[in-house]
C-alpha cells in the first residue's frame, strides 16, 4: 500500500535565486520558484536557478564559497554554516493548506518569511533559507 | 498558531548560533508591524551536515 513520492525539492531561497535538488512546480503567486518545503529527499545545494516563467528554469554552477579558519557551526566543504530555526506565529491559524506549497496561504506566508529573513540578516554572509515546514502550534 | 521550522544558511565564519537568535529576536517587533507576524518561542540550533530534510525537524513536536 505504498504511494508515490511527492517529487518535491528542498530549495535554498535567496533574493529570487535558489539552490535546488530537483525542479518544483511553478508558483502561482511568488516571485521565486515554489517555496521550499520538506520532502522525502535529502537537501542538497546543487545549483543556482532563477525561475523566469512557469516552464523554464536556468541553471548555472554555484561559485565556491570562501572558507574561513574558524567554524561557527558544522560545515559543508564549500564553507556553509547551517542553523535550524523554529518559532511560533501566534496571530495566524494553521490549516492543512500549509502542508502544500502550491496553495496561496503557503506561498504568501513563505514569501513574507523569506522577505523577513532577508531584512534581518541583510549583512554579508546570509545565503538563504530552505526546508520551510509549517505545523500547528 | 503556526509553528515555522526552517534552515538558514550562512557563509562559514560569519555568524554563530547566539547571534542568529539575537538578531532574529531583535526584529520581532518590526516583523509584527511590517508583516503582521506575531513571533514567539524562538529556538535556534546548529544543523550537522551532511543532513537530510528528515533529520533536522525533530527538535519540537
Amino acid at each position: 500500500a505504498s504511494g508515490s513520492a511527492s517529487g518535491s525539492a528542498s530549495t535554498l531561497v535567496h533574493n529570487g535565486t535558489s539552490a535546488r535538488a530537483t525542479t518544483t512546480p511553478a508558483s502561482k503567486s511568488t516571485p521565486f520558484s515554489i517555496p521550499s518545503h520538506h520532502s522525502d529527499t535529502p537537501t542538497t545545494l546543487a545549483s543556482h536557478s532563477t525561475k523566469t516563467d512557469a516552464s523554464s528554469t536556468h541553471h548555472s554552477s554555484v561559485p565556491p564559497l570562501t572558507s574561513s579558519n574558524h567554524s561557527t557551526s558544522p560545515q559543508l566543504s564549500t564553507g556553509v554554516s547551517f542553523f535550524f530555526l523554529s518559532f511560533h506565529i501566534s496571530n495566524l491559524q494553521f490549516n492543512s493548506s500549509l502542508e502544500d506549497p502550491s496553495t496561496d496561504y503557503y506561498q504568501e506566508l513563505q514569501r513574507d518569511i523569506s522577505e523577513m529573513f532577508l531584512q534581518i540578516y541583510k549583512q554579508g554572509g546570509f545565503l538563504g533559507l530552505s526546508n520551510i515546514k509549517f505545523r500547528p502550534g | 498558531s503556526v509553528v515555522v521550522q526552517l534552515t538558514l544558511a550562512f557563509r562559514e565564519g560569519t555568524i554563530n548560533v547566539h547571534d542568529v537568535e539575537t538578531q532574529f529576536n531583535q526584529y520581532k517587533t518590526e516583523a509584527a508591524s511590517r508583516y503582521n507576524l506575531t513571533i514567539s518561542d524562538v529556538s535556534v540550533s546548529d544543523v550537522p551536515f551532511p543532513f537530510s530534510a528528515q533529520s533536522h525537524h525533530h527538535h519540537h513536536h
Partner: antibody
Framework: EVQLVQSGAEVVKPGASVKMSCKTS????????INWVRQRPGQGLEWIGY????????EYNEKFKGRVTLTSDTSASTAYMELSSLRSEDTAVYYC??????????WGQGTLVTVSS | DIQLTQSPSSLSASVGDRVTITCRAS??????LNWLQQKPGKAIKRLIY???SLDSGVPSRFSGSRSGSDYTLTISSLQPEDFATYYC?????????FGGGTKVEIK
C-alpha cells in the same frame, strides 16, 4: 518507501460505531497530515476530514461533523478515524492519504466497512 | 463547496491512443489540483500534483495542464497498465472535492 497500512474490513450494525486505523512507515518525519476519504460502492471519492499527526488539529467536512472523530498516536505513527451512528449508506471503502511535501501524496489500501443488520 | 465537473465519465481506447481527461472547476483553484489513478484492489496512486507536476516514478506519458478553469490530464500513448479510473482532486479550499471520475476501458 512510504507505506500506509489500514486496518481490516469491518461488518457493523446500524447505529453502532466503527474505529479504523492507518499506520504509516518508511518515513522519518513524525509530523504530517492525514486526510480521510471514502468511496461508496460504485461511487466517486468523498473527503471526510484531516488530522495533523501528533497534534489535536483537525478539519472536518461539514457533512460528517458530529459523527466523525479523528485522532492520532504519534509514537505508533498511526491515525484513527471513528464514525458513529452508522447507517447503510455509510457502507464504503475508507481511505487514508498522507502528506509528503504536499497533500494527498501517499494512499492506503482502504478499509471496507459494511453496515448491515 | 467547489464543484469539479470531470469529463468524460468513461471512454474506450486502444493501446497507443492519446487520451485526454478534463476537469472544470466551479471557482478559482489556482494550481491546487491533483490527478489520481485507481485500479481495482490497489491503493490509489497520485500521478500529478499542483496541476502539472509529475510524481516520482510516474511515466512521462502522463502530463497535466491548465487553461483557465479547465484542467487536463493527458496520456500521450496509452499502455495496457493505464486502464483504470482517474479522478481529479482540488485542495484550494475545504471541503476538498473530487471529480466524478473517468473510467478508461479497452476498446
Amino acid at each position: 518507501e512510504v507505506q500506509l497500512v489500514q486496518s481490516g474490513a469491518e461488518v457493523v450494525k446500524p447505529g453502532a460505531s466503527v474505529k479504523m486505523s492507518c499506520k504509516t512507515s518508511g518515513y522519518t518525519f513524525t509530523s504530517y497530515g492525514i486526510n480521510w476519504v471514502r468511496q461508496r460502492p460504485g461511487q466517486g471519492l468523498e473527503w471526510i476530514g484531516y488530522i495533523y499527526l501528533g497534534s489535536d488539529y483537525t478539519e472536518y467536512n461539514e457533512k460528517f461533523k458530529g459523527r466523525v472523530t479523528l485522532t492520532s498516536d504519534t509514537s505508533a505513527s498511526t491515525a484513527y478515524m471513528e464514525l458513529s451512528s452508522l447507517r447503510s449508506e455509510d457502507t464504503a471503502v475508507y481511505y487514508c492519504a498522507r502528506s509528503g511535501g504536499s497533500l494527498f501524496a501517499y494512499w492506503g489500501q482502504g478499509t471496507l466497512v459494511t453496515v448491515s443488520s | 463547496d467547489i464543484q469539479l465537473t470531470q469529463s468524460p465519465s468513461s471512454l474506450s481506447a486502444s493501446v497507443g491512443d492519446r487520451v485526454t481527461i478534463t476537469c472544470r472547476a466551479s471557482q478559482d483553484i489556482g494550481i491546487t489540483l491533483n490527478w489520481l489513478q485507481q485500479k481495482p484492489g490497489k491503493a490509489i496512486k497520485r500521478l500529478i500534483y499542483a496541476t502539472s507536476s509529475l510524481d516520482s516514478g510516474v511515466p512521462s506519458r502522463f502530463s497535466g495542464s491548465r487553461s483557465g478553469s479547465d484542467y487536463t490530464l493527458t496520456i500521450s500513448s496509452l499502455q495496457p497498465e493505464d486502464f483504470a479510473t482517474y479522478y481529479c482532486l482540488q485542495y484550494a479550499s475545504s471541503p476538498y472535492t473530487f471529480g466524478g471520475g473517468t473510467k478508461v476501458e479497452i476498446k
